[in-house]
Amino acid sequence: FPMFKRGRCLCIGPGVKAVKVADIEKASIMYPSNNCDKIEVIITLKENKGQRCLNPKSKQARLIIKKVERKNF
């Protein structure tokens, strides 16, 4: 539940470039806020295998963000 951690960015370092879609249970997008001045894409893996930060500049992250934002407006 990354959304409940407050006061700092959640991702340390650049993050991974890609995660296999078949391994992804869900994803969260954290938009810039007072807590963190950058966008973060957090992947939750299937089978309780934890979470990964996706590099927001990666092709996969940009695709996710683009699809989400296109649907919103």
């Epitope: 992804i24 249970e25 869900k26 994803a27 969260s28 695709l63």
Partner: nanobody, 120 residues
Framework: EVQLVESGGGLVQPGGSLRLSCAAS????????MGWFRQAPGKQRELVAS???????IYADSVKGRFTISGDNAKNTVYLQMNSLKPEDTAVYYC??????????????WGQGTQVTVSS
Amino acid sequence: EVQLVESGGGLVQPGGSLRLSCAASRSGLSINAMGWFRQAPGKQRELVASITRGGPTIYADSVKGRFTISGDNAKNTVYLQMNSLKPEDTAVYYCNALIDYGLGFPIEYWGQGTQVTVSS
């Protein structure tokens, strides 16, 4: 950015009732699941109830028979009717949604939380 807007929290006496609501800020979304979690001071977050598209409705054992979750697809809204409230139901209640954008996995969203306090 989709936002989940919660309302309905407050102070209620033991045995009383409250109805929480949570609405997604945009229409036309494909919502896989919506639900409620709660977190009491010093405790871990726990699932209260969840409703899925075409799937089962899930309740925590501690609220079965007292709480009822329902959804309004047209309004992208989920409700939690809480009856026979107990002091141990006191917590911050968070709305959660899993939205399908055709990526092969859903995007998860959380509300900001609404406080429910059960006390005499």
